[in-house]
């Protein structure tokens, strides 16, 4: 018979034959042969594999480093990684939660809509037309552009979401 060119789901092609993948939580020890099944071994303590696989090494569980403010939210199993979260009052810097911050800052061009609390991080909003923020801040709102007219001046340089307008003297027409 012709050797297969493709295998079924949960199988892989090796040496012109289809072998069973190892189930989640197990790693590959040896490929199948014409006479033997794929040999798999369970992952060790603090290791995991979360898919049907042909990996020869299991992945290490994530370490929730207390020096970075992390703690274990959900302990890993042979099939799942450990899930970290931040100590109470702190906030993850990313979805993967690799480190913690007290709160995040809003970048220039954004203002603080809501200051962080123990349960929710800083909420930022883009500065609308007529407002700006030129700093990174965890408490400052967008500031309104300076009104040149009220100072008897004219706009010399338009404002942006990151910069204030620049005012200058009005051109005096000579008689």
């Amino acid at each position: 018979p012709e050797p297969p060119t493709a295998c079924r789901e949960k199988q892989y092609l090796i040496n012109s034959q289809c072998c069973s993948l190892c189930q989640p939580g197990q790693k590959l020890v040896s490929d199948c042969t014409e006479f033997t099944e794929t040999e798999c071994l369970p992952c060790g303590e603090s290791e995991f594999l979360d898919t049907w696989n042909r990996e020869t090494h299991c992945h290490q569980h994530k370490y929730c480093d207390p020096n970075l403010g992390l703690r274990v939210q959900q302990k890993g199993t042979s099939e799942t990684d450990t899930i970290c979260t931040c100590e109470e009052g702190w906030h993850c810097t990313s979805e993967a939660c690799e480190s913690c911050v007290l709160h995040r800052s809003c970048s220039p061009g954004f203002g603080v809509k809501q200051i962080a609390t123990g349960v929710s991080d800083t909420i930022c909003e883009p500065c609308p037309v007529g407002f700006f923020s030129n700093v990174s801040s965890a408490f400052e709102k967008c500031h309104p552009w300076t009104s040149c007219e009220t100072k008897d001046l004219v706009v010399q340089q338009a404002g942006t979401n990151k910069t204030d307008v620049v005012c200058g003297p009005q051109d005096r027409l000579r008689a």
Partner: nanobody
Amino acid sequence: EVQLLESGGGLVQPGGSLRLSCAASGFTFAGYEMWWVRQAPGKGLERVSAISGSGGSTYYADSVKGRFTISRDDSKNTLYLQMNSLRAEDTAVYYCAKEPYSFDYWGQGTLVTVSS
């Protein structure tokens, strides 16, 4: 290495005053937004007050408005919190924090106890 060292805490009677200091080193203090945060026994973190990098803008939690004053002296690389009319509910460990507010920039804090 960034270091923030809080001091000035102690035992004070209700209605009394204290001035906390936060000595910063290992970074250019001027221009950085700074915060005072506190943690009462058995409670979560509370953001108390903040000051902008220029010193021109400040923030105060409602619980301390009119009683606490935040300030900075960039020539001394020091942040201050003047606390007046202290109440029992102000009892907490007080910490200062700098942007980007990461856990590894966290100081040891200074304990303020308001009790008669």
